[in-house]
Interface confidence: low
């Protein structure tokens, strides 16, 4: 409606004796700012003077003044929106109506907000949700229709008097809409928390009790029980009895129906509060409980375990591990089902008691073949002695044991011989499978276990077998010693050191590699001529005959080897020199005449030079010294002379006759 | 012939880790067992660590609880992971191969050099 001033505020304002009024309030005025402002308590219209009658609270003055008595009620507001009040200390006669009187230049309005303040500070109010069940989490709320600036308060929660250390969230609300203080509390009741008292407590600023509100909770949980036995501990033995009674210590609602569970699994007929056992017998041993629901669900007694005592049961052998491999470690278990347990255990092996062994467990640390066999065990506890079970078998593996190499042939082997040998072992389990020989060779294996070499070497030494099963044991190498003739005869020339002069002192050495049998003998021999029975072959003074195919033998009881032809080779001066003459040592003039010089040397005649009858070189150095023509002044005697590394040697002395043709002849 | 190929070698930090491999080829047995050797300079070869073609293992004491064999028969493959490296397991590490399950190591790898610094 366009012709009314228009304000927003809380309808009801709440507070006590003491405390103060904080009035929030919006307005809009119909026309131009508000130019005046009176707040009446109980405002009552004069129709005859048109005005209002009241207690006048506050009032605004032309200079925006307020007298002192006014100090009390403040206007917080402006001249066009804001219409906030604050009553500070407020009291009790304050209860009623507030009456805004506005004024505009042109337009006039009356607004009425009520106030209630009580003689003492009112209780707070605590929200519930509909229905709280245990360990579900709730929110309670306390809340109070009351806030003011001037006077803080604060709400606490308590629990059966008792502080409740969960931390609850305070807020406040001071707008035109609403005024309130509200605590929130979240909380996850238990069932033990049923009919408890919770109380929100109103404090001022100093945690002075002002007022407060309580509630009983009403949590909703599964029955409670407690579960009792006769004998207390639960401990009996087979054909006694045991009663076991179930009490509902809480349950809200109340329950509806009661069961026994044994292991977990429902007992059937079993429906009331007590559960009756005669003459039990072990295998009601087990966790009993009772069960009793209600609309909330199932609640669970703590569970009673009842031991039913009885001697050891016919007894059984776990091994860990068989089969079992030499040297391992093995564990034996003894198990037998007794109430109590066993205090002592009896093992035997292979029927013989096992002497110092009272335990559950027999450890054997390192398992030898004869731990082979049968265990078995008895257990004992108070109530008796169990029997004896079939028992459990251990099976010891161990690779094949004294693995030996042996040699069928008769000694000695000789190269070329076919060798046959076998491997032999003492004991093995698994069995022996395979056999493996070392070294690695095409060799023929007849029949497992045995090996033949045909045509033996003389360079195979020794030979070792192994047994296999799971494993292979390798026996000790044999050693065949094989025997052969002597291996790489060779000559070595020991002196001289150099090449081999005529005159020179010369020894031959007969080497071989190896022997078996080591004793030899050694012949020399030169162009199939026998020289000597010595392993050297010594010159005093060589010479030029002595050169020449030398073969030296070596031989043992085996057979004979010979070297390569070994070349002697002897250096000497040119020697045996000579001059032959061609065509003859008589020629015609005119004719051609050829001397050469002849001669024996090593090396070869590299250099030779021509002499006359007068001893004068001629400038000719060829073996060859070629006369053309001839003429009769070149008669007379020559010789020459030859050079090699070694020296040089000269020929006696050679007569060339030339003599006169018959023109020559006739002429004269 | 049994040809052996290790791999994985190489320079580590004293507390850090290396896995050495052995590739195996040409072995016929099918119960067999390939090892670990060490040798430092100046020092005999020593043994490491063992693996049978059917699961068995061992150790040497001062190996024990760092260093883990494993094989991958279908791979015919030996591996070594060694943790918490020490400067005393510097060495060249030999992989060998040999029949049976306590075998005797007939074919020896060229060897694989680990070196850990401290």
């Known amino acids: 409606d366009s012709s009314k001033w228009v304000f927003e505020h809380p309808e009801t304002l709440y507070a006590w004796e003491g405390a103060c009024v904080w009035i929030p309030c919006t307005y809009r005025a119909l026309d131009g700012d508000l130019e005046s402002f009176i707040l009446f308590h109980n405002p009552e219209y004069n129709k005859n003077t048109s005005k209002f009658d009241g207690t006048r609270l506050y009032e605004s003055t032309k200079d925006g003044k307020v007298p002192s008595e006014q100090k009390r009620v403040q206007f917080l507001g402006d001249k066009n929106k804001n219409c906030t009040l604050s009553i500070h200390p407020v009291h009790l006669n304050d209860s009623g109506q507030l009456g805004l009187r506005m004024e505009s230049k042109t337009e006039k309005w009356m607004e009425r907000i009520h106030l209630n303040v009580s003689e003492r500070p009112f209780p707070p109010h605590i929200q519930l949700p509909p229905e709280i069940q245990e360990s579900q989490e709730v929110t309670l709320t306390c809340l109070l229709n009351f806030s003011c600036y001037g006077y803080p308060i604060q709400l606490q929660w308590l629990l059966e008097g008792v502080p409740m250390r969960q931390a609850a969230v305070t807020s406040t609300s001071l707008t035109i809409k609403s005024v309130f203080t509200r605590s929130e509390l979240k909380f996850s009741p238990q069932w033990s928390h049923h009919g408890k008292i919770v109380t929100c407590q109103l404090q001022d600023a100093d945690g002075k009790f002002l007022s407060n509100d309580t509630v009983q909770l009403n949590v909703k949980h599964t029955p409670k029980l407690e579960i009792k036995v006769t004998p207390s501990d639960a401990i009996v033995r087979e054909g006694d009895s045991v009663t076991m009674t179930c009490e509902v210590s809480s349950s809200n609602p109340e329950y509806t129906t009661v069961s026994w569970l044994k292991d977990g699994t429902s007992l059937k007929k079993q429906n009331t509060f007590t559960l009756n056992l005669r003459e039990v017998t072990k295998d009601q041993s087990g966790k009993y409980c009772c069960q009793v629901s209600n609309d909330v669900g199932p609640g669970r007694s703590e569970e009673v375990f009842l031991q039913v005592q009885y001697a050891p049961e016919p007894s059984t052998v776990q091994i860990l591990h068989s089969p079992a491999v030499e040297g391992s470690q093995v564990e034996f278990l003894c198990m037998s089902l007794a109430n109590p347990l066993p205090t002592n255990y009896t093992w035997y092996h292979n029927g013989k008691e096992m002497q110092g062994r009272t335990e559950e467990k027999v450890h054997i640390p390192k398992i030898l073949p004869w731990h082979a066999g049968t265990y078995s065990c008895v257990a004992e506890n108070i109530l008796g002695t169990g029997q004896r079970g079939p028992g459990a078998e251990l099976d010891v593996q161990y690779p094949p044991k004294k693995v030996t190499t042996v040699i069928q042939n008769p000694m000695p082997i000789r190269e070329g011989d076919t060798v046959t040998l076998s491997c032999n072992y003492n004991s093995s389990n698994p069995s022996v499978t395979r056999y493996e020989w070392k070294p690695h060779g095409a060799w023929e294996e007849p029949s497992l276990g045995v090996l033949k070499i045909q045509n033996v070497g003389w360079d195979n030494t020794t030979i070792a077998c192994a047994a296999c099963n799971s494993w292979c044991s390798w026996a000790s190498p044999v050693a065949l010693n094989v025997q052969y003739a002597p291996r790489d005869v060779r000559v070595r020339k020991i002196k001289p050191l150099s090449e081999i002069h005529s005159g020179n002192s010369v020894s031959l050495q007969c080497d071989f590699s190896s022997s078996h049998p080591k004793e030899v003998q050694f012949f020399w021999e030169k162009n199939g001529r026998l020289l000597g029975k010595e392993s050297q072959l010594n010159f005093d003074s060589i010479s030029p005959e002595d050169a020449g195919s030398y073969s030296c033998w070596v031989n043992n009881s085996i057979g004979q080897t010979a070297s390569k032809a070994w070349t002697l080779e002897v250096l000497y001066a040119p020697r045996r020199l000579r001059v032959s003459m061609s065509p003859g040592d008589q020629v015609m003039e005119g004719k051609s005449a050829t001397l050469t010089c002849e001669s024996d040397a090593n090396p070869p005649v590299s250099h030779y030079t021509w002499f006359d009858w007068n001893n004068q070189s001629l400038p000719y150095h060829s073996q060859k010294l070629r006369l053309e023509p001839v003429k009769v002044q070149h008669s007379g005697a020559y010789w020459c002379q030859g050079t090699n590394s070694v020296g040089k040697g000269r020929s006696p002395l050679s007569t060339l006759t030339v003599y006169y043709s018959p023109e020559t002849i006739g002429r004269r | 012939q049994v040809q052996l190929v290790e791999s994985g070698g190489g320079l580590v930090q004293a507390g850090g880790s290396l896995r050495l491999s052995c590739a195996a080829s040409?072995?016929?047995?099918?119960?067999?067992?390939m090892a670990w050797y060490r040798q430092a300079p100046g020092n005999q070869r020593e043994y490491v660590a063992a693996?049978?073609?059917?699961?068995?293992?061992n150790y040497a004491d001062s190996v024990r609880g760092r260093f883990t064999i494993s094989r991958d028969n279908d791979k015919n493959t030996m591996y070594l992971q060694m943790n918490s490296l020490r400067p005393e397991d510097t060495a060249v590490y030999y992989c060998t191969w040999g029949t049976g399950r306590f075998a005797d190591y007939i074919y020896w790898g060229q060897g694989t050099q680990v070196t850990v610094s401290s």
């Open positions: 693996a049978s073609s059917d699961g068995y293992t």
């Open positions: 040409g072995s016929t047995f099918s119960l067999n067992t």
